[in-house]
Every structure is written in C-alpha cells, then in structure tokens.
C-alpha cells in the first residue's frame, strides 16, 4: 500500500475547518474490514483519529476530527479537523495498514489575519516641529507573529528607533504593538504596515501630522 499526502502545508484560518488530505490506492476487492488507518501527531505520537477492525474508532483529539466514511473505500483517508486552533499547528502522520503498511506526514499551518492597525500619538497636542513624538501602531488577534514595517510620507523605510513587541493571548493569537520614536518635521505622514507572513496579508495604518489638528 502506498500513502500519498500533499507536499505543501495545509493553511487553515483559526476557527475554520481544515482537511488534511491523505490517500492510498486500494487493491481490487478491497474492503473496509481490511483497513487500519491511524492519524497521529508526528512528534508526540498522540493519537488523533483511527479506523481499525472495520470501524471508525472516533476522535481521540478533543472530539474535533472526522474521517470521510463514504470515501474510505475509494482510498480517501483524509482527516477533517474542525474549529482549528493555534495549538493544532504541526505535523500529522497518516498511517495506513492493509496487507502491508505505509505512512506520510502532512503539515498544518494555522493562521489568523491581523486587524486594521490603530495609531496613537504621544504627546498628542501642542506639537511643534523638532518635538520628539512616539507613534504607536497596534494590531490584534493575528497568527503567526507579524512583520512590522514603518515608512514616511515619501515611502522611505523608517528603521531606527522602532520597538516592536508581540504578545500571545490565551488563544495563542498575537497582539502586536510597534512604537516609532521620531523628531517631527514641519508636517509628515507616518505609516505602519503589519504583515501576516503566512497569509501574505498586509494591514495598514497611518497618521498625518500637519500641525493641528491631527488626522489618523
């Protein structure tokens, strides 16, 4: 028996369902009574789901997994993972035993888009050219960790005096806070871009300082 899985990682959004594809080529006359299918976490060997002795033994993984029972006899051993969480990320092994056995691993990459950044300024009044200001760009509930880029109004990257921190919440999603310290010119626009490296999703925020008032 030969097991085949996707070479590329499966990318799944948090709280959506994901399908980890796995297939084998059944011999003529194959029946489900001959099939023994085990899905497990590759690294820890934790059992995720199994089909043995002719029947679905069910989910061993927080009751969020399912096979495609009607497709098994055709060689479709794929696993459905419901309501994906950050902690589901990793490698899954699909093991098929009929007369002989084979296995292959498929990677699950979890992702969540970052929110549109909010911009804050400190101080936020009585600003004069030459003042040092702190601009904070905050974006929430993304995964994995973001890449943050700052640019001025002419699109020139600002790399000095940038401090970025990322904190995971209880669901494993990241809140990103990036702080730019800059000396004000006569006027200017400062924009921050928060990029999700997996989704290739960019979230933009900007602040324009033209004396008073400020525009965000």
């Amino acid at each position: 028996v030969e097991v085949q899985v996707s070479e590329d990682p499966v990318v799944a959004l948090v709280d959506t369902d994901a399908t980890l594809r796995c297939s084998f080529s059944p011999e003529p006359g194959f029946s489900l009574a001959q099939l023994n299918l085990i899905w497990q976490l590759t690294d820890t060997k934790q059992l995720v789901h199994s089909f043995t002795e002719g029947r679905d033994q069910g989910s061993a993984y927080s009751n969020r997994t399912a096979l495609f029972p009607d497709l098994l006899v055709q060689g479709n051993a794929s696993l459905r993972l419901q309501r994906v969480r950050v902690t589901d990320e990793g490698s899954y092994t699909c093991f098929v035993s009929i007369q002989d056995f084979d296995s292959a691993a498929v990677s699950l990459q979890v992702a969540a888009p970052y929110s549109k950044p909010s911009m804050t300024l400190e101080p936020n009044k009585d600003l004069r050219p030459g003042n040092m200001v702190t601009i904070t760009c905050s974006s929430y509930q993304g995964y994995p960790e973001a890449e943050v880029f700052w640019k001025d109004g002419q699109g020139v990257p600002l790399t000095g005096n940038v401090t970025t921190s990322q904190m995971a919440n209880e669901r494993g999603l990241f809140d990103v806070h990036s702080v730019l310290r800059v000396v004000l010119g006569a006027n200017g626009t400062y924009s921050c871009l928060v990029r999700n490296p997996v989704l290739q999703q960019d979230a933009h925020g900007s602040v324009t300082i033209t004396g008073q008032p400020l525009t965000f």
Epitope: V1, I38, K45, E53, S97, D100, F101, D102, S103
Partner: antibody, heavy 119, light 109 residues
C-alpha cells in the same frame, strides 16, 4: 546492506529483568516493523511482540502481556526488548527481526542474544 | 488465536529426493503465510512469503502453495544444505502479530 546487531549474552537471576538492544543499519529505521522472537533451547520460534517505530505503537503476544516492553529510539535506530520477572523458562535466544519496507513479515534477523536465567 | 500445526515433525530423506512439508491453520489465514528455514546456531531465513512467493535469493527448488487453512512447502530436489528445520508462520493484520508453527525437521536418512 541491512544489518541488525544485538547486544551480548546475559546471565540473570530469577525475578530480575533483562533489556536486549537491537541496532539497525541500512534503510530508514522508522519505516520498518521490528519483531522480537525467542527460541528456548531445542524448541521452536515464539513471537513475543513488535513495534512500528514511526507510530511508536508496540503490541505483544498475549503470553507476554504485562511482562514485556518493546521500545524504539529513532535517534539511534535502536529497538529494545525488556522482559521482567524472569524465570528459568525464559532461558532462550532472543532475536530481533525486521520486515522489508512497509512489511510486517520479518526478513532480516539479528544474530540473537542468549539470555540465561539461573539462580 | 490462530494455531499452526506442522507435519510431519521429522522428515527423513536423502539428497535428491522431494520434500513435502505441511502446515495447517486452525482458521483461515488467507494467503498470509510464510516459510522459514533455520540451521543450528543460525537465525531463521525467510524462504516463502504470501504462501507462494519466493524471497530474494531463494533457489527455485523451493516452492509454496495453498490458501485458507492448508499450505505446503515443497523442496523439489534436496541439496545437502537444505537439511534444517522449517517453520511456517502466519501474520494477523491488526494489531500486527505473528504466529509460528512447531517446525518440521528435515534430516538426512
């Protein structure tokens, strides 16, 4: 060239335990099923249990259930068989054997390890 | 649990003769039956798998047949190096397990 090299002969006291190792070379260790088979002097072959390293799942013959533990260390391509509560009847040559890729059937065998249980 | 019964326990033959060894299973094992040869002081050697397939490097004088519960190993013309003990073995698919027969000793008459 597939080779299974087992640890050396052991003399044990009744009630003690023995752990026999089997180092594999040639092929990807995880992809093969490892069996342990023993043979008492002048007797036939007796399957004790086996393991598929990629799964980390071992299973045992009913006769040895609770007394034998089979493990595999992928990092060193080594399988282990530990037998506890030894008695005189456990005196035997212990073999590890490996199937071909994806096969349970043993077609490569170690040289055997003689375990003697004597007071 | 499947029991494999081999007969005869001992077979006394001369070089050049035909050897016929029998293995009977207590219930059907389909064609998941193998034959091994073992010489004194050596590990077993796989001869036949899946009832009738010769393992790599096994001479054509060895052949296997049968399915279900009755199996036969035939050595068409015994060579001096063929005098040994022969074991049949079945395997269960899940959980994977093996069972050996009691063995047949082929000795020089």
């Amino acid at each position: 060239q597939v080779q299974l090299v087992q640890s050396g002969a052991e003399v044990k006291k009744p009630g003690s335990s023995v752990k026999v190792s089997c180092k594999a070379s040639g092929g990807t260790f995880s992809s093969y099923a490892i069996s342990w088979v023993r043979q008492a002097p002048g007797q036939g072959l007796e399957w004790m249990g086996g393991i598929i390293p990629i799964l980390g799942i071992a299973n045992y013959a009913q006769k040895f259930q609770g007394r034998v533990t089979i493990t595999a260390d992928k990092s060193t391509s080594t399988a282990y068989m530990e037998l506890s509560s030894l008695r005189a009847e456990d005196t035997a040559v212990y073999y590890c054997a490996r199937g071909g890729s994806g096969r349970y059937l043993p077609d490569y065998w170690g040289q055997g390890t003689l375990v003697t249980v004597s007071a | 649990e499947i029991v494999l019964t081999q007969s005869p326990a001992t077979l006394s033959l001369s070089p050049g003769e035909r050897a016929t060894l029998s293995c009977r299973a207590s219930q059907s094992v389909s064609s998941y039956l193998a034959w091994y040869q073992q010489k004194p002081g050596q590990a077993p050697r796989l001869l036949i798998y899946d009832a009738s397939n010769r393992a790599t490097g096994i001479p054509a004088r060895f052949s296997g047949s049968g399915s279900g519960t009755d199996f036969t190993l035939t050595i068409s013309s015994l060579e001096p190096e063929d005098f040994a003990v022969y074991y049949c073995q079945q395997r269960s698919n899940w959980p994977p397990s093996l069972t050996f027969g009691g063995g047949t000793k082929v000795e020089i008459k």
